[in-house]
Structure formats: structure tokens, C-alpha cells
Amino acid sequence: IWELKKDVYVVELDWYPDAPGEMVVLTCDTPEEDGITWTLDQSGEVLGSGKTLTIQVKEFGDAGQYTCHKGGEALSHSLLLLHKKEDGIWSTDVLKDQKEPKNKTFLRCEAKNYSGRFTCWWLTTISTDLTFSVKSSRGSSNPQGVTCGAVTLSAERVRGDNKEYEYSVECQEDSACPAAEERLPIEVMVDAIHKLKYENYTSSFFIRDIIKPDPPKNLQLKPLKNSRQVEVSWEYPDTWSTPHSYFSLTFCIQVQGKSKREKKDRIFTDKTSATVICRKNASFSVQAQDRYYSSSWSEWASVPCS
Amino acid sequence: VPGGSSPAWAQCQQLSQKLCTLAWSAHPLVGHMDLREEGDEETTNDVPHIQCGDGCDPQGLRDNSQFCLQRIRQGLIFYEKLLGSDIFTGEPSLLPDSPVGQLHASLLGLSQLLQPEGHHWETQQIPSPSPSQPWQRLLLRFKILRSLQAFVAVAARVFAHGAATLSP
């Protein structure tokens, strides 16, 4: 058992049929010695008397808010939450496995540049009685500071009969060094509490591995005189790290015919312009990736050829 | 380069960009294969890293590129020795068309561009002996290549910036 916050405790339980559970001793926070009784949640049923109450916590029915009273007056409270461990693995019932980039991915994180700022998000089908807290650091044995903002409900989607909620948080490394080679990973820890169930989720990554640039901007087409060719140009996204001579991007460009089945010609270039044949009803697209490290490609930026 | 002369920025840029390509073809990203384990904070200390105070940022390069270039060269020699060690030459054997050989030669080539004959900078101690089990060796290869990818990315940025802004 450990204290999550004042008067709120997490009981770690091995979860299997007929498990013995954990013995927990609750102490009433009062100088009084006599006439103390204990109740659980809103039930008026007296569970025991005396300054301490010993309980065997085996299931969710044993968790909840315990109150000690004297003469009809509440003296102190303790809230017990459960953290389940099944077959040696902590439960992950609250958040949804996003399965990207691999199974058991509950937290996903992305960065638009090397500034030390990143966003993490997670999914759940649970709407009410759900709370989160987030902590982050660089490294774990001698952690360096990372400051996370508020968790916000960033999207709601209907998936069949279920509603899915996406929560996200933005964090910023306190002393980021964009040009250095990261030695220790960023750690992100999310505590999730649903009713009386406590769970924690972690993700560990280097910023370089979660980079996903914004799409190139100001995508423009300029027809060349007396030719079927057009000159296309684009710019680095505003959110990308500067100077661009140091933080360089590479680009993938393609012309896509009206039919999705039509063969797409893809060309890779480090330049911010190209000459292509752009037929009527086709569209031109460009995406960006860090030039020197194979992290994610940006989403496509597109313009119609006509 | 030693003694304050400028490197052949454009040549270094080309070779470092080639190194990036080779490092990724030697160990492509296998679904974000997570090679970090407990205690990794300690094992990552074995390899040289380009750190914040090494002057490899744009401002540091403008002020005095020598500190950064020396750091890069130390790293190149370190990785070149690793790729030539029995971690890579022992079992399991590399495939005949493995890019590791080219990567090894390119590391040597770039380190020589940064230090012509006759100059010797101190280099970092070569790493501890290779593990005995083939599977351990294979895992160590992956870790070394992942670490090398990060190192050469920073080096390539340095040379690209140098070629664009510091070339005579």
C-alpha cells in the first residue's frame, strides 16, 4: 500500500481466484481513543470500532472511502484504490491499446521539431468518473525536468456502439538542447483512476524518434510556357526547427491521377522545388521528413494540378 | 583541421549524408524496435555522444568549430573500431551484401578527412570485450547501429550547416 495523495491510498493486489488479498490497517486521525466507529462509503453499516480498523482487501467491494466517526461526527477519511496485477502484469483496462507503432502502445507521442516540446495522447471508451495526472522527466535514475501542461479532451469519436475519447497533453523539456545527441530517453508517466481502479502507464522515447514534421507550406504551381510541365515549389513548415541549413528536411513528391489505381510517381528531393508533368484532374502532393534521421514522414500537403 | 584550419565542409557534408543513409540501411527501423532495457542509462555512457557543451550547435560552430569537429572525429573513430571488432566480424556472420562494410569504410574516410596524416588527436578508449553469445552480439549490433544513426545525424547537420554558412 502507498499514498497517492493526502488520505488516498493505492492497494496493490495480485488478482486471481481466491487470492488472499492484502491486509490493510487504517488509523483514525484523531487524539480521541474511545467511541470511534468505522463506515465505508455512503453505507451507514458499522464495520468496526476503535482507533484502528484492520481489513482484508481482496476485491473492489473492499475499496472505497472509509470514515471514522465519533458521536455522529466524521473525524477522518481514507480512500482506498486498487491496482490489479494479473499473472505478474499490471492491469491496463482503462486505456485502449493503440497498436501503433506496436502492440501494447497506450500512450503515443509526437514532436514537430527538436525544441523539446512534444504532445502525447491516449484513448479510452470511459466517459465519467475518470481522472488523470501526468509526470515526465528525461532519464529516470537522475531525472532532468520536463514540464507538462493540462490534460485536455482533444477528440470524441463514435466507433460502432462505443464513444471513444482522446485525451492529450503537451510537455516541454525545461533545458532542451536541440542540437545535441540525446543520451537519455524522455519518460512519460500517466496515472489513470476510474472509479476505484488505479492504473499507471509509461512511455519512454527519444525526441528524435517521435519527430513528425508538419506538412510543407505554401505549395504553389507555376505552368512553364509552351510545355506540359509545371514548376512546383513549397516551403519548410513554420513549426520546423531553425536554421534550416542545420535542421534540414528531405521531401517526397508525387503526382496522383484522378483514379486512385493510377500509378503514382514518387520522387525524393532535398530541394524545395521541382519540375513535374501535372495533368488535368491530377493533384500534386509533397511530404517532409528529417533529412538525416528516419523518423516519421509528415502528412501530405496537396494542390490540384488544374 | 587540427590547429584551426577549416575542414573540406562540402566533402564532409557529402560523406556524412552517405553515412546516414548507410547507417539506416544497415539497421532499418523495425517497427520502432525498442532496444532500451533496464540499466540502459548506464550502458549508453560507453559510447561518445555529441553533448550540449560540445559546440555543435549553429552558434557554437560559428564561434569555434574545432571543439565540435574534434568531438565528431572521436566518435567516428570509436564507431569505426566497433564496426571492425568481433562484435561485427564474429558469429552470426553478416550477410555478404551487408552495408556494414561500406559503413565501416565511410567512417574511416570521414575521420581521415577531419585529420590529415601526421596529426593525432587523443581518441576515446575502445569499448569493453564483445559478448560471447551470438544472440547477445546480435542485440549489441542493433544497439550500436541505433546509437550510430543518432550520432551521424548530428554530424551530418553540422557539416551541412558548415558547408552552407562556413565554407570560404
Partner: nanobody
């Protein structure tokens, strides 16, 4: 210093309506769940209603569902409790609570970090 100040409580006839307000100062709670709890004489403090940071998710105690509505105005850093079809058993001191956590909030009062002084609601038959 964080302060939550409730207002709007008074004596009202059964079947009547009231609107409680809770204004927060000292910090913004626009991303945090806030809620209402109540305590009748000689009884435990009980959960009434909670609302998520953006106001999109609400949760009510069964005893008030369909009669009470919780809402918030983040620009004013204020939450409200519209109470309709009041019953004598709704008589209690109503407390506003704010959490330092995120999400849709908890029905347990110990999960809240900031509390108001309370406003008295008395429903006469």
C-alpha cells in the same frame, strides 16, 4: 491563494428552483474537473454532480439525475448548479470542489484539492 466562493443558496419551497454559482480565483480550472457535493445535518458529505474541464462530460448522483444540471463558464472561471423540482431531502450545505487532476472527475471528495465554504439550501415542504 486559491479560493472557491459559492452563492445562491436560500430557503425555497418544495418543487421550486435555485441556481447555485461557484466562482474560482487564484488559478484557472478550465482544464480541471469541478463539482458539487452536499452535506445534510448528521450525514456524510455526498457527491451531487461533476463536470469535466471543457464542460463536455457530466456525471450526476442518481438522487438528482433529471432534476439538477451542472454547467460551467470557463471565461468566468465559474461553475453552476441549476436545481429544479427541489425536494425536502435536498436540504443540505452545498460545497463546490475543484480538482488538481484532469479528466472527467471523481465521485470521491478526497480526490478534490480545493473546496468552498459552502452555501445553505433549505427546501421546506
Amino acid at each position: 491563494e486559491v479560493q472557491l466562493v459559492e452563492s445562491g443558496g436560500r430557503l425555497v419551497q418544495a418543487g421550486g428552483s435555485l441556481r447555485l454559482s461557484c466562482a474560482a480565483s487564484g488559478r484557472t480550472f478550465d482544464s480541471n474537473p469541478m463539482g458539487w457535493f452536499r452535506q445534510a445535518p448528521g450525514k456524510k458529505r455526498e457527491f451531487v454532480a461533476i463536470i469535466s474541464g471543457n464542460g463536455g462530460i457530466t456525471n450526476y448522483a442518481n438522487s438528482v439525475k433529471g432534476r439538477f444540471t451542472i454547467s460551467r463558464d470557463n471565461a468566468k472561471n465559474t461553475i453552476y448548479l441549476q436545481m429544479n423540482s427541489l425536494k425536502p431531502e435536498d436540504t443540505a450545505v452545498y460545497y463546490c470542489a475543484a480538482s488538481g487532476l484532469y479528466g472527467s472527475g471523481s465521485v470521491y471528495d478526497l480526490m478534490y484539492d480545493y473546496w468552498g465554504q459552502g452555501t445553505q439550501v433549505t427546501v421546506s415542504s
